[in-house]
Structures are given as C-alpha cells and as structure tokens.
C-alpha cells in the first residue's frame, strides 16, 4: 500500500509536471507567439484513456514530437531551452509512471493540435492531484 | 499626447453590419499591436480581437469569430473592426487598445475612450 | 481559456483606510520566458480602463504609489494603501499571459 510520504512525493511530481505543462501551454497559447498559426499545424495523438499514472506511457511517447515543434519557437518565448524542458518533463514521467511495468498506450482516432494535447494532459494531472489530496 | 479616439458606433438592427475606426496619435503606431475589447452595458470588459504591429497575426475571441475582422493602416494610424452579422448580444461600448510586446511588455497600457455599437430592433 | 475570479465583488472602504483586492487564476500564469503577464486595471465611473499595474507589480507610470500588487502564479492582490475619493471606481484583473481574459470587477465605494 502506497505511504503518505510515496503519496506526498508523487503528488509534488506531479505538481512539477503541472507547472511544468502549463508553463509550455503558456508560451504557445498566446497572441504575441509568433509561430502560433505553424504550431497549430502539428498533429499530436491523445490517449484514448488517461486516468492512472500508468497512462503517462502515451505522453512520454509524444515528447520527441513535442520537443520538435517547442524548437519552432524564438529563443525568447522559452527561459529554458526545449531540449532541457523535454528532458525535465521525462524524468518526472519516468519517476510517476515506474518502470517496472510495460504499458502499451493506446490512442485515439483523433488526433489533436498541441494546445489540446498541452491541456488534455494538464487535465489529467489536475484530476490525479485531486484525488490525493 | 498619446490619444486613441474610436468612432463609427450607432445603433443597428441585428444581422446587419457596421465599422468602426480608431485613429491613434502622439506615437509610433506601426510598432504596437493592437486590441479591440468591449463591454456590454453593466458588465465586464471582454476581449474580442488583437492585430500585430505589421497586420501579419490577428485573433479572435470565440464569441465573434467568423464574424468579426481586424484590420490597420499604418500609414493613415487607422485601426478598424468590421462587424458581420450582428447580434443583441454585441451591444456594447468598444474600447481600442495599444499594447508592446517585443521590447518592454506592459500591457495594454493606453485606451480610447470607445464607441457604442446598439444591436437592436 | 484561463478564468480570473476576483474577490470581493464589492468593497465599501473608509477614506484614509486600506482596501485589498484579489485575483486567482485558474491556471498558473508563468509565461515560459519567465515574466507572468498579470495586470491591474482602474475604470472610474463613466472613463475607460486605465492601466495601474503590470507584470504583477510593477507601477505603471503616473500610477500613485498607494497602489502595489503582489503575488505569484496563481494568487495576486492589489492593495490601496489609504483610499482616496479619486480611486472610487471598478478595479479589474487581466491576464495576457494567453489569450486575453478579465476578472468580473471589484467595485470599491466610500462607506
């Protein structure tokens, strides 16, 4: 059974994700971004379920993609290069998701645009947090 | 001084369309980007739709999208909103908005004093 | 799109007394390149918004120092610090860090 310290550590993972998520959203998702309009152009594919930590399989499979389109963006919308972002972001997924166990992610028919795939996944980690605390 | 003045607010009958203009002076005009944002009678203010410095990007809010268009003219300082197909709900003072982005970003920091659009029967 | 809820609705202040306003998004608004685009806005009755703050705290020019925010992320405050019969009007949030979005109002009056 999971302890309140393991509970306590997972649920500031996932905040760190959170912020993490929201912070890329925030630098894509806005009027004075100047490559908005290409961005939106990508395609990303969104997990047909998303409700257990194990699901996060289906996002660290879409990091590389989602590196390549944040490298589209100035330099100044980023404070930190995509490349550092990404691999925050798949250390706290490897960290959440455990590596003991293989998940095959399943996707959806449809695919998404990043800012839909950005809040899908903001979505998910809202709804983990909630239910521990 | 820095001044925004709309004009080219009245009343009109749903579904129809009307335009309207702010002339902006006492700055470089070419080098903001530009909002329009509104507020209905009582309420709040709402953002509707921004433009960028060289007219290469505009937005919209949801609620006019499809509706509602964007434009300037650097040359003359002019910035417009064509209205489309409008509705009782667009009933509203529309205020333009200056706002920097690329060197020191404040915000929407100079506004009009607005206009009054009246969609009604 | 992020929501900004303001809090309270209505403030009825004494003249010379404090008056706080506060704002929380629904999202955390830290742009990545690190600045977090949270404005305050002053509409006295009959006049256009007028900016008061920007980038959380910073005085806009012209802007009375009785007026500060604060705050980070999620949560910021803007603080009269001795209310004046000139700052009766409606106070707004505004957040740029996406796409543009106001809180409600917070209408500060003179008991």
């Known amino acids: 059974a999971p302890t309140s310290s393991s509970t306590k550590k997972t649920q500031l993972q996932l905040e760190h994700l959170l912020l993490d998520l929201q912070m890329i959203l925030n630098g894509i998702n806005n009027y004075k971004n100047p490559k908005l309009t290409r961005m939106l152009t990508f395609k990303f594919y969104m997990p047909k379920k998303a409700t257990e930590l194990k699901h996060l399989q289906c996002l660290e499979e879409e990091l590389k993609p989602l590196e390549e389109v944040l490298n589209l963006a100035q330099s100044k919308n980023f404070h930190l290069r995509p490349r550092d972002l990404i691999s925050n972001i798949n250390v706290i997924v490897l960290e959440l998701k455990g590596s003991e166990t293989t998940f095959m992610c399943e996707y959806a028919d449809e695919t998404a645009t990043i800012v839909e795939f950005l809040n899908r996944w903001i979505t998910f980690c809202q709804s983990i947090i909630s239910t521990l605390t | 001084q820095v001044q925004l003045v709309e004009s080219g607010g009245g009343v009109v009958q749903p579904g129809r369309s009307l335009r309207l203009s702010c002339a902006a002076s006492?700055?470089?005009?070419?080098?903001?980007?530009m909002h329009w944002v509104r507020q209905a009678p009582g309420k709040g203010l709402e953002w509707v739709t921004v433009?960028?410095?060289?007219?290469?990007?505009?937005y919209y809010a949801d609620s006019v999208k499809g509706r509602f268009t964007i434009s300037r003219d650097n040359s003359k300082n002019t910035l417009y909103l064509q209205m489309n197909s409008l509705r009782a709900e667009d009933t509203a003072v529309y205020y333009c908005?200056?706002?920097?982005?690329?060197?020191?970003?404040?915000?929407?920091?100079?506004w009009g004093q607005g206009t009054t659009v009246t969609v009604s029967s | 799109d992020i929501v900004m809820t303001q809090t309270p609705l209505s403030s009825p202040v004494t003249l010379g007394q404090p008056a706080s306003i506060s704002c929380r998004s629904s999202?955390?608004?830290?742009?990545?390149?690190?600045?977090?685009?949270l404005s305050w806005l002053q509409q006295r009755p009959g006049q256009p918004p007028r900016l008061l703050i920007y980038?959380?705290?910073n005085r806009f020019s012209g802007v009375p120092d009785r007026f500060s925010g604060s705050g980070a992320g999620t949560d910021f405050t803007l603080k009269i610090s001795r209310v004046e019969a000139e700052d009766v009007g409606v106070y707004y949030c505004?957040?740029?860090?996406?796409?543009?979005?106001f809180g409600q109002g917070t209408k500060v009056e003179i008991k």
């Open positions: 908005a200056r706002e920097e982005w690329e060197l020191e970003d404040y915000g929407m920091d100079v």
């Open positions: 006492g700055f470089t005009f070419s080098i903001y980007g």
């Open positions: 433009i960028w410095y060289d007219g290469s990007n505009e």
């Open positions: 999202q955390s608004l830290v742009h990545s390149d690190g600045n977090t685009y």
């Open positions: 980038k959380i705290s």
């Open positions: 505004m957040q740029t860090t996406q796409f543009p979005t």
